[in-house]
Amino acid sequence: LPAQVAFTPYAPEPGSTCRLREYYDQTAQMCCSKCSPGQHAKVFCTKTSDTVCDSCEDSTYTQLWNWVPECLSCGSRCSSDQVETQACTREQNRICTCRPGWYCALSKQEGCRLCAPLRKCRPGFGVARPGTETSDVVCKPCAPGTFSNTTSSTDICRPHQICNVVAIPGNASMDAVCTSTSPTRSMAPGAVHLPQPVSTRSQHTQPTPEPSTAPSTSFLLPMGPSPPAEGSTGD
């Protein structure tokens, strides 16, 4: 005959563990039912009565089978620089991600706690490393023979046009200006040194370079004093 199915609460056999979706209550010394996601333990079990579960209140949740006395608070509402990609429900926390043009500067277990705008490289500087969801743009000075005349988080340094006769030499923030004869544009975007006669190469004023390890504004895992505690608000 099959073994009789035990109903919670029950005393486990010595050395055995409680079944799936059950927990061992130290006070009652019994295996008791866990509460389902979206619920919490309102009354803990005794030797004679099982766990009493209740639904999470508004703006609180439990994601797992549990026996917590209170549901967890949903995170604070998404800020204006964020997009809510998952709403706060009784079974899941709110998830905020950064809107386009921004990156996650301080991550949390799920989603993002702090977004910051992608850095814009000023004229004379181009993008050395593009931004991602979790890292900022890195800018670099435009090398001789290249320029950027924009303030942009996406534009790289582009090669100066090659002139038959130069009217105004290019520099880090301005393209060369040719005389009325047609220029020939270099076909190697991002090229640093262009094969051109010395007499026609545009002059370049090198800007003061940033440190070789160019700065980035991502601040993912705080390593010094902790970041401020996260706020929590209801809907």
């Epitope: 940033e210 700065p215 010094g224």
Partner: nanobody
Framework: HVQLVESGGGSVQAGGSLRLSCAAS????????MSWVRQAPGKGLEWVSA???????NYSDSVKGRFTISKDNAKNTLYLQMNSLKPEDTAMYYC????????????WGQGTQVTVSS
């Protein structure tokens, strides 16, 4: 011992001005770049402004044209000049330092409270 200590917060009427300071010690100021972040009561963190090693700066839309970030490398101090303050600027303001070439906020201050009444 690394420290970032903010000061200059306080209570002000809407339209008024405040200047926040953040004194840094225990690390090479010029090897980091600095940022201001704020947290309004019951809300999440909001990025405000950053200043980079080449002294270029960046601002959130909500403060652009009203706030100015600056730094004094000789004094190891970061500043935030806040003009035309609005009630929605009420928050705890934190300065933070990011080591150049990394993708991590390395150090945070303890914050200074700014309260703007209408």
């Amino acid at each position: 011992h690394v420290q970032l200590v903010e000061s200059g917060g306080g209570s002000v009427q809407a339209g008024g001005s405040l200047r926040l300071s953040c004194a840094a010690s225990g690390f090479t100021f010029s090897s980091y770049y600095m940022s201001w972040v704020r947290q309004a009561p019951g809300k999440g963190l909001e990025w405000v402004s950053a200043i980079y090693s080449d002294d270029s700066d960046n601002y959130s839309d909500s403060v652009k044209g009203r706030f100015t970030i600056s730094k004094d490398n000789a004094k190891n101090t970061l500043y935030l000049q806040m003009n035309s303050l609005k009630p929605e600027d009420t928050a705890m303001y934190y300065c933070a330092a990011i080591r150049i070439g990394t993708d991590q906020y390395k150090f945070w201050g303890q914050g200074t409270q700014v309260t703007v009444s209408s």
